[in-house]
Interface confidence: low
């Protein structure tokens, strides 16, 4: 099969015959890559090219979510000759170029892992030397970040006909199951959840009816550990008060 | 060359289930994707999904998750679909492809195999 | 999902005469692909990128277009062209395709 194909910016003709592997761009990158939120991560990507020995400039980039149109994460850009690709980008400073270029390699490592970082990465290189020409990966790795559970908002808020509600957020990749515990409720009660709140590891659980002074519990668990928090509700001369503290335990 | 031999037409009852095939030959099946495209009269052409035999890694059209699914064997260069919960929707004639990358990065479904017509009858 | 809307569904020409289908998408992609299929037989791949015809295309096709409005191009229609022309895009999941253009010759 062969392609023609003229190069806009350079105008030039570019023919390509499809024969071996070595002599056609393609990208190698596993379908997915998993690690804990806090470590690092490596994200892999090799590439072939048909320009047996194309050693002018070339740009690296990783772009997150989308390809061709997501944010670019990390760029780095080496000079004609260069072994050496000079970082233009590395978002929030947490991305590192682990491969060479010059060797088809662009794997990437990623800093401080945070569930937010858990989405599709793809690799992209540019030539733009004597040769015109680039490619990117289409499907990408997935980068699925885990984490233990976490409550990031635990609060008590007025109801219905006087009476109070408490809502508890939780983060953590499985995501997490939430339980409340307290007065009269017995242990592990029936909580409305509500998951996905603008996020896939976020997890919401109202408690609709708060009808006993004291403390009550939110529990937060997955596969790598838990997570507690407690309100405590008192209301005099028609007045209300809460206040709030946390427990956090960790899986090793 | 490039080829893509197709199983043959299928016959099959409301609620089976069928699998058809696509055999590969004259390049290394482990280099690209394999694509399926679904066609019924009057519908135009859809794309089910995808499968890249190299890396064992698929991507499949939301509309088709739970009704198709693609597998791959490198040892004979064979990639293979499975529909499952057949109806009369699913009567159509489906293509698989090779899929093949141009200069910018981006896909075209540059081989296709002759089709295999299913036919969903009671 | 990214919807292709082909127009004119049916178009009819003589030999010689210039044809233009259109393909129009629901939002913006880079590029757009074409493919022609013929009654009976697989759809070939007949434009890539937008512009650029695969190998055996005669040079009397053409492809232009960019952000929701791209088209297919005939200089002077023969016979052979008789066909379904379908276009398709990459931007973003599920790859879609138009409905089709199907050309007649008179």
């Known amino acids: 099969f062969v392609r023609t194909k003229i190069d806009t910016t350079e105008n030039l003709l570019n023919t390509e015959v499809h024969s071996s592997p070595a002599q056609r761009w393609s990208m190698q990158v596993p379908a997915e890559v998993s690690a804990a939120a806090g470590d690092a991560a490596v994200l892999p990507c090799t590439f072939t090219h048909p320009h047996r020995h194309y050693d002018g400039p070339l740009t690296a980039i990783w772009r997150a979510g989308e390809p061709y149109a997501g944010p670019q994460v990390f760029r780095c850009a080496a000079a004609r000759g260069s072994e050496l690709c000079q970082t233009a980008l590395s978002l929030h400073g947490r991305f590192r170029l682990l491969g060479n270029p010059r060797r088809n390699d662009l794997s990437l490592r990623v800093e401080r892992l945070a569930l937010a970082d858990d989405r599709r990465y793809f690799c992209r290189v540019e030539f733009a030397g004597d040769v015109h020409d680039r490619y990117e990966s289409r499907h990408g790795v997935r980068l699925h970040v885990t984490a233990a559970p976490r409550i990031i908002n635990i609060s008590v808020l007025p109801g219905p006909a006087h009476a109070f509600r408490a809502l508890c957020t939780a983060e953590g990749e499985p995501p997490p199951a939430l339980a409340w515990s307290g007065p009269a409720l017995g242990n592990g009660s029936a909580a409305v959840p509500s998951s996905g709140q603008g996020h896939g590891h976020l997890v919401t659980a109202e408690l609709p009816a708060l009808n006993h002074d004291g403390r009550y519990t939110c529990t937060a668990a997955n596969s790598l550990g838990r997570s507690e928090a407690s309100v405590y509700l008192f209301r005099f001369h028609g007045a209300s008060g809460a206040s709030t503290h946390h427990h956090h335990h960790h899986h090793h | 060359q490039v080829q893509l031999q197709q199983s043959g037409a299928e016959l099959v009852r409301p609620g089976t289930s069928v699998q058809m095939s696509c055999k590969a030959a004259?390049?290394?099946?482990?280099?690209?994707?394999i694509g399926w495209v679904k066609q019924r009269p009057g519908h135009g052409l859809e794309w089910v999904g995808d499968?890249?035999?190299?890396?064992?890694?698929?991507n499949n059209n939301e509309k088709f998750r739970g009704k198709a699914t693609l597998t791959a064997d490198t040892s004979s260069s064979t990639a293979y679909m499975q529909l499952r919960g057949l109806t009369s929707d699913d009567s159509a004639i489906y293509y698989c492809a090779r899929v093949d990358y141009d200069y910018d990065g981006s896909y075209i479904m540059d081989y296709w195999g002759q089709g295999t017509s299913v036919t969903v009858s009671s | 999902q990214i919807i292709l809307s082909q127009s004119p569904a049916l178009l009819s020409a003589s030999p010689g005469e210039k044809v233009t289908m259109t393909c129009r998408a629901s939002?913006?992609?880079?590029?757009m692909y074409w493919y022609q299929q013929k009654p009976g037989s697989s759809p070939k791949p007949w434009i890539y990128a937008t512009s650029n015809l695969t190998s055996g295309v005669p040079a009397r096709f053409s492809g232009s277009g960019s952000g929701t409005s791209y088209s297919l191009t005939i200089s002077r229609v023969e016979a052979e062209d008789a066909a379904t022309y379908f276009c398709q895009q990459w931007n973003s999941k599920p790859w879609t395709f138009g409905g089709g253009s199907r050309l007649e010759i008179r």
């Open positions: 004259g390049y290394t099946f482990t280099n690209y994707w």
């Open positions: 939002s913006s992609v880079s590029y």
């Open positions: 499968i890249h035999p190299g890396i064992n890694y698929t």
